[in-house]
């Protein structure tokens, strides 16, 4: 029993207030924001994160928008509302009593109502298409080490299991990860992969969620592999729902 | 070293009341939870309740509640239980540990015995 | 409560035996898990802890292993000095809970 032991800290998450007063002396960490006791042997869910984040000191910080191909994520921050579970509740609303629903990311999925707004359920995302453009290199990369880095990334990082890194696509300077998982083909204790995605841009824009780890160093052949735009695309099961204004606007 | 050092025996009435104390050493006294260990002569152990002083949060096995206080001195590391109206069934040994995840030191004991 | 069932109560084994204890819990506890030495007179000490991480100081012939419900205690080489009691202790949830002991007397 050593010292290092004695360390009770969230190793998965940073955003969070940690005490050894679980049952035994259990270190237990809950996230700020929420209070909620959070498993740290496992990634975070993202609405926990977001609340976590809306709750933190507020710096400076420029919101990327990103253009509108189908479901991106153009509303950045918002402080959400999260399920007993730490799922996004499917309806969410401002302080203005503006509502909307959103998907298993929390991503908006309709228009913006009021209150008598209903979601009548979390539409799950079950496909996440990551793209990526990396900064100029002397050489393309090759692309079944860029797959097997960013599969071995993936499972190893974010403990995805290997199955739902569907594909890893590129044609220089552009790569493109596609993240599956249906409802049926998520088993108790699986990642989530809309966690794994979150923290992975998180990750890609130099602000790791992992307490005292090192930022993500990505390298291929002991290439560095720099990225400098990252675009997500989210696709639900059930199709959203968003007037006819705002798909010709 | 981590060394919990219990006060002594005690003898008590019917129906007193004992406060006993679990002086903590070695350690930062704020960072760990202190448990009170209950045992009975050739029985074994039962779980009474826990402390961190770090924030004075308690918890209690639900047959001491009412009967334990479970208190922590910050000046002077020490941990405290007392016992409230007494009986024979309370006669035991009691112990208390600093846990960490499951792992313990115990102190010494300290034994308690309830006669008119 | 976590209720934890643990045997044998008691057992004779003879030097340089191997040794295994038991404990069922009534439900998954995710391998918080613990084990105690006590022997006559004296406070308990800490074996195992984490189902299976043994404490620094404690000789290698102790181990424990198990999940879920189900976890065990070996000594793989029973010394004269290994004779007490020894309890599991379950830490999942409050309250914590002892299983019953076992005492382990040379045969």
């Known amino acids: 029993h050593t010292a290092a032991q004695d360390n009770c800290t969230c190793p998965t998450n940073k955003m969070t207030v940690c005490s050894p007063d679980g049952p035994g002396g259990r270190c237990q960490c809950r996230a700020l924001g929420s209070g909620m006791a959070v498993d740290c042997s496992t990634l975070t869910s993202k609405c926990l994160l977001l609340k976590a984040r809306m709750s933190a000191p507020k710096n400076a910080r420029t919101l990327v928008r990103p253009s509108e191909h189908a479901l991106v994520d153009n509303d950045g921050l918002y402080d959400p509302d999260c399920d007993p579970e730490g799922r996004f509740k499917a309806r969410q609303c401002n302080q203005t009593s503006v509502c909307w629903c959103v998907n298993s990311v929390g991503v908006r999925r309709t228009d913006k109502g009021d209150l008598s707004l209903r979601c009548d359920e979390l539409v799950r995302t079950h496909h996440i298409l990551i793209d990526l453009r990396h900064r100029p290199t002397a050489g393309a990369f090759n692309h079944s080490d860029l797959d097997a880095e960013l599969r071995r990334l993936f499972r190893e990082r974010y403990r995805l299991h290997p199955k739902f890194v569907a594909a890893v696509h590129y044609e220089q300077p552009t790569i493109q990860i596609e993240l599956r998982q249906n409802t049926s083909q998520k088993a108790a204790g699986d990642v989530d992969i809309g966690d794994a995605a979150y923290y992975f841009e998180r990750d890609i824009k130099g602000e790791s969620l992992f307490q005292g780890r090192g930022g993500l160093d990505l390298r291929v052949r002991g290439e560095p592999l720099q990225v400098e735009r990252t675009l997500i695309y989210y696709l639900d099961e059930i199709p959203p729902k968003f007037s006819m204004k705002r798909l010709t606007a | 070293q981590v060394q919990l050092q219990q006060s002594g025996p005690e003898l008590v009435k019917p129906g007193a009341s004992v406060k006993m104390s679990c002086k903590a050493s070695?350690?930062?006294?704020?960072?760990?939870?202190i448990n009170w260990v209950k045992q009975r002569p050739g029985q074994g152990l039962e779980w009474v309740g826990q402390i961190y002083p770090g924030s004075d949060g308690t918890y209690y096995n639900e047959p001491f509640k009412g009967e334990a206080t479970l208190t922590a001195d910050k000046s002077s590391n020490t941990a405290y239980m007392q016992l409230s109206s007494l009986t024979s069934e309370d006669s035991a040994v009691y112990f208390c540990?600093?846990?960490?995840?499951?792992?313990?030191?115990w102190g010494q004991g300290t034994l308690v015995t309830v006669s008119a | 409560d976590i209720k934890m069932t643990q045997s044998p109560s008691s057992m004779f084994a003879s030097l340089g035996e191997r040794v295994t204890i038991t404990c069922k819990a009534s439900?998954?506890?995710?391998?918080?898990l613990s084990w105690f030495q006590q022997k006559p007179g004296k406070s308990p000490k800490t074996l195992i802890y984490?189902?299976?991480r043994l404490v620094d100081g404690v000789p290698s012939r102790f181990s424990g292993s198990g999940s879920g419900q189900d976890y065990s205690l070996t000594i793989s080489s029973l010394d004269y000095e290994d004779m007490g009691v020894y309890y599991c202790l379950q830490y999942e949830e409050f309250p914590l809970t002892f299983g019953a002991g076992t005492k382990l007397e040379l045969k």
């Open positions: 984490r189902a299976n």
């Open positions: 439900q998954d506890i995710n391998w918080y």
């Open positions: 070695g350690y930062t006294f704020t960072d760990y939870v």
């Open positions: 540990a600093r846990f960490f995840e499951g792992f313990a030191y």
